[in-house]
Interface confidence: low
């Protein structure tokens, strides 16, 4: 660390400045003025926060911030003609009917265009029919119907609570098992804690709630219209048809008041198991259709909603590098939001915020990072990450050759427990030195490291004394950098305790209950955990510009391709006949391991004993570290899903939040006993082992000495 | 309109103290980080001493640590520099200068202060 | 310390002439580096900034080169207004410190 704090007269400052310029006030005056009416994408209430986001980051003092827009596909209900859910008697007269809209919170009574529960890019449609509960909606969970049961979803709706995965995924299966329709509640069991009373006299979903969201499966694509290619002026577009992870039947939320009047008259079935059992005082039955008094009636859905091209805009702000401007490490969380946003994305935004003033006020005291920062307030990724994808797909070549890193800065609490941080290998230590550095904003940790809070209370379960650190999946912005481009990403935010909260996610999400007063009164009163959260984002930023050597250890690679090649491996084994049968070796892929490890332990004695005064070698050494994230990307993409490209690590092709690892030869392996024609099957397999055995090793050779 | 107001210099006698006074109007004067700089007679520019906007943090250059000391009043807008043991090879015309991007893009007029027996 | 040599001391030089100063650095300094133009009883002003970034309302013939330790200013086309004395200065590390500065007189 340098010595000289931050004034005009030396760009060598620490980071301890940086840090002290943060401040909580500073982070609640900006998350209210974020959250006092909606920032719909597409809206001109977003436009407007745009354009007052890129003059306040003027005034801080970024170099130079500009708007970047484009015409990517959105979705809105039609305000005339509301979509809700009835159900029918024989006559086809609806006895019932679901909200329209949740009743608003305190103070928002008059705040107009608070737009209704919907689920974004649903088609058009009046499917009536029987009701089938399928839990989750997980793979699984139509394993349990279909194969078990013999519950056939054909030609009926399904009705799923949210929760677990991601719900484009819960869709996707529902279409594939013959659905004709999709309704998503929030079931209490999932988004009530105990013990906690509900909006606003605490943190938990009223009945009315309703959590909003996409439905779409693009695996990385953008927008639908323009996949791989920036929505700009001159863009070509795809007809509707053509268009990408678009569903294919109506899918609707509603809350838990309306869940109870589908489900206390579903018949058929029993649940399987008490897993498939939720909160409500209903027997949860699996169907097909209601009990015996009520099985002439059935499920109506009315949805209207239209899918449109639609303006959206960015706002990159730029803080020039002083020494390497041609590096770009960025800082981006997305500005729109569902409703007010007071979580998600705003109390992320207002972090960006105060780290933006932090820089700029550095700046104007003199420093300059070493190398350049990218700031980012990205639009529509409530949509689909649509705002960052297609910046992403419009600055592709910049980025590929310049990317350092990329930190998102999405919501900064899901919850007031402890740290939680999803990564590349390559920032483990990173995070570590750092939060060894800052103080644990925690009860009963006063004077303790946040390195210390967080080991105690999420600990890693392969490395003692270690806390834990999580794959990076997808559902965020990092999404497009990460697993198409390959540059190396993180994300970092306050969360749960998920041992005693089972819940999924926080109660609250994407409903019109995430306000100002859900933070300030029940999260985060003072405002603790968002200025830790400023400091961890901010802090890897920070020494992601601005440290010499770039702060990523390659040994930390070495160490989990092992433990993924070692879980691959053991996932396989569970058929060793057929791994017999079919010649199925994971040799080659031990062996390149194996190489990488050693290769990353000689780069690294190289990296501590190597000339930092003679500024090519340095950047030789710099660039090596860069490009190893790079290296792991195959330009042909993972088998369709072309937009994830990264070997090591993609979306879970069951749930886009979770990262899984070797995807390649993990989704060949999925289910691979019921595929009709194994010697295709396996032969896939033994193809996807030897992708990942020549990436390892192609990415192991570029750390090797260069000549 | 932007500018800043030296005021404070005039003649002392070696060993004696003086407080120079800059006061800045035109633009938000916590934002930024504040220099002195001076020029002796016929000769070229020394940087004195510098202070974040804040206040919080102090830089000095060898030649006067220890016997001057700079502050700021972001209240008034107003920046200072206390000088105390005060030698002839400090005379000098005494400029404060307003630091951005590691520049000095904003200059007072000067005041002249003469150390002389 | 790092030490700002510049070079020369004093130029005569006539209207429209094209101008050259050059200031080298003992270390590396990067692009922090920036040019003053002092008239006599007058405060200096900043020209440039950064090696080459022209500070806004000074004309456009003046410019900025260089990174390391060795830089230039140039003057494309000499004007009555611009016989001055040039000064450089550095600020990548504790203290920043002036060249020796260059008098541009009427030859």
């Known amino acids: 660390k340098s010595s000289n704090e931050a004034t005009n007269i030396t760009p060598k400052h620490n980071m301890k400045a940086f840090l002290d310029e943060l401040k909580a006030e500073n982070i609640k005056k900006f998350l209210y003025n974020f959250t006092q009416i909606p920032h719909l994408a597409g809206t001109e209430q977003n436009f407007q926060l745009a354009k007052q986001i890129q003059s306040q980051w003027k005034e801080f003092g970024l170099d130079s911030v500009e708007l970047a827009h484009y015409d990517v596909l959105l979705s809105y209900p039609n305000k005339t003609h509301p979509n809700y859910i009835s159900i029918i008697n024989e006559d086809g007269n609806e006895i019932f009917n679901t909200s329209l809209f949740e009743p608003p919170p305190p103070g928002y009574e008059n705040v107009s265009d608070i737009v209704p529960p919907f689920s974004a890019f649903s088609p058009q449609g009046m499917p009536e029919g029987d009701l089938v509960y399928v839990n989750y909606a997980r793979t699984e969970d139509f394993f349990k119907l279909e194969r078990d049961m013999k519950i056939n979803c054909s030609g009926k709706i399904v009705i799923a609570r949210y929760g677990k995965v991601f719900r484009g995924n819960k869709v996707k299966n529902a279409q594939l098992a013959g659905a004709k329709g999709v309704i998503l509640y929030s079931d209490p069991a999932d988004y009530f804690a105990p013990g906690v009373k509900s909006y606003p006299d605490g943190w938990n979903l009223p009945g009315g709630g309703v959590q909003r969201g996409n439905i779409l499966n693009l695996n990385g694509a953008g927008d639908p219209l323009t996949p791989g290619y920036p929505a700009n002026e001159y863009a070509y577009r795809r007809g509707i048809a053509e268009a990408v992870g678009l569903p294919s039947i109506p899918v609707h939320p509603i809350g838990y008041y309306d869940a109870q009047k589908l489900l206390e008259k579903m018949g058929g079935s029993a649940p399987p198991d008490s897993s498939w059992r939720g909160s409500l005082k209903v027997p949860y039955n699996v169907g097909p259709g209601f009990t015996g008094n009520f099985s002439t009636q059935k499920v109506k859905m009315h949805i209207h909603s239209t899918n449109e091209v639609t303006r959206i805009y960015n706002v990159i702000g730029t803080l020039r590098g002083a020494v390497e401007p041609d590096r770009y490490v960025i800082l981006g969380g997305h500005r729109d939001s569902w409703v007010f946003g007071g979580i998600d994305p705003q109390s992320g935004a207002a972090v960006v915020h105060e780290i933006v003033r932090s820089f700029g006020t550095l700046k104007k005291e003199g420093w300059r990072p070493r190398r350049t920062i990218l700031f980012a307030s990205w639009d529509a990724e409530e949509f689909g990450l649509l705002g960052s994808t297609e910046w992403a797909e419009e600055n592709s070549r910049l980025l590929q050759e310049r990317g350092v890193a990329y930190i998102n800065a999405d919501s900064s609490i899901e919850g007031n427990y402890t740290l939680r941080v999803d990564c590349t290998p390559l920032m483990y230590s990173l995070v570590h030195n750092l939060t060894k550095e800052l103080k644990s904003p925690d009860e009963g940790f006063e004077g303790k490291s946040l390195y210390e809070s967080w080991t105690k209370k999420s600990p890693s379960p392969e490395f003692s004394g270690m806390p834990r650190i999580s794959k990076l999946g997808s559902g965020n912005d990092f999404e497009v950098f990460f697993q198409r481009l390959g540059i190396a990403s993180g994300r970092a935010r306050y969360t749960k305790n998920w041992e005693t909260n089972k819940f999924s996610g926080y109660p609250l999400y994407h409903s019109v209950y995430e306000t100002y007063e859900l933070v300030e009164k029940f999260y985060d009163p003072m405002f603790k955990y968002h200025l830790t959260v400023a400091q961890v984002r901010g802090g890897m930023v920070f020494e992601l510009a601005n440290s010499i050597v770039l702060p990523f250890d390659c040994r930390d690679y070495a160490v989990v391709l092992r433990k993924y090649a070692d879980k691959i491996y053991s996932i396989s084994m569970k058929h060793p006949q057929e791994m017999k049968t079919y010649s199925v070796s994971f040799d080659s892929l031990f062996s390149a391991v194996k190489n990488f490890t050693e290769i990353a332990s000689k780069f690294s004695e190289r990296l501590q004993d190597f000339d930092k005064s003679n500024p090519i070698v340095l950047r030789m050494m710099n660039d090596q570290l860069m490009f190893l994230e790079r290296a792991f990307i195959d330009p042909l993409g993972l088998p369709d899903r072309p937009f994830y490209r990264h070997v090591i690590y993609a979306p879970s092709s069951h749930n886009k939040y979770a990262g899984e690892s070797f995807p390649g030869i993990y989704d060949a392996l999925f289910d691979i006993e019921s595929k009709v024609d194994p010697s295709k099957a396996w032969g896939e397999v033994k193809r996807q082992i030897y992708v990942a055995a020549f990436t390892v090793q192609a990415a192991a050779e570029t750390l090797s000495e260069v000549a | 309109e932007v500018q800043l107001l030296e005021s404070g210099g005039g003649l002392v006698q070696p060993g004696g103290s003086l407080r120079l006074s800059c006061a800045a109007s035109g633009f938000t004067f916590n934002n930024y980080a504040m220099n002195w700089v001076r020029q002796a007679p016929g000769k070229g520019l020394e940087w004195v001493s510098a202070?974040?906007?804040?206040?919080?943090?102090?830089h000095y250059a060898d030649s006067v640590k220890g016997r001057f000391t700079i502050s700021r009043d972001n209240s008034k807008n107003t920046l200072y520099l206390q000088m105390n043991s005060l030698r002839a090879e400090d005379t000098a015309v005494y400029y404060c200068a307003r630091g951005v991007a590691a520049t000095l893009n904003l200059w007072g007029q000067g005041t002249l202060v003469t150390v002389s027996s | 310390d790092i030490q700002m040599t510049q070079s020369p001391s004093s130029l005569s030089a006539s209207v429209g002439d094209r101008v050259t100063i050059t200031c080298r650095a003992s270390?590396?300094?990067?692009?922090?580096l920036h040019w003053y133009q002092q008239k006599p009883g007058k405060a200096p002003k900043l020209l440039i900034y950064?090696?080459?970034n022209l500070q806004s309302g000074v004309p456009s013939r003046f410019s900025g080169s260089g990174s390391g330790t060795d830089f230039t200013l140039t003057i494309s086309s000499l004007q009555p207004e611009d016989f001055a004395t040039y000064y450089c200065?550095?600020?990548?590390?504790?203290?920043?410190?002036f060249g020796g500065g260059t008098k541009v007189e009427i030859k």
């Open positions: 202070i974040s906007g804040s206040g919080g943090t102090t």
């Open positions: 950064d090696a080459s």
């Open positions: 270390q590396s300094i990067s692009r922090y």
């Open positions: 200065q550095q600020s990548y590390s504790n203290p920043p410190t």
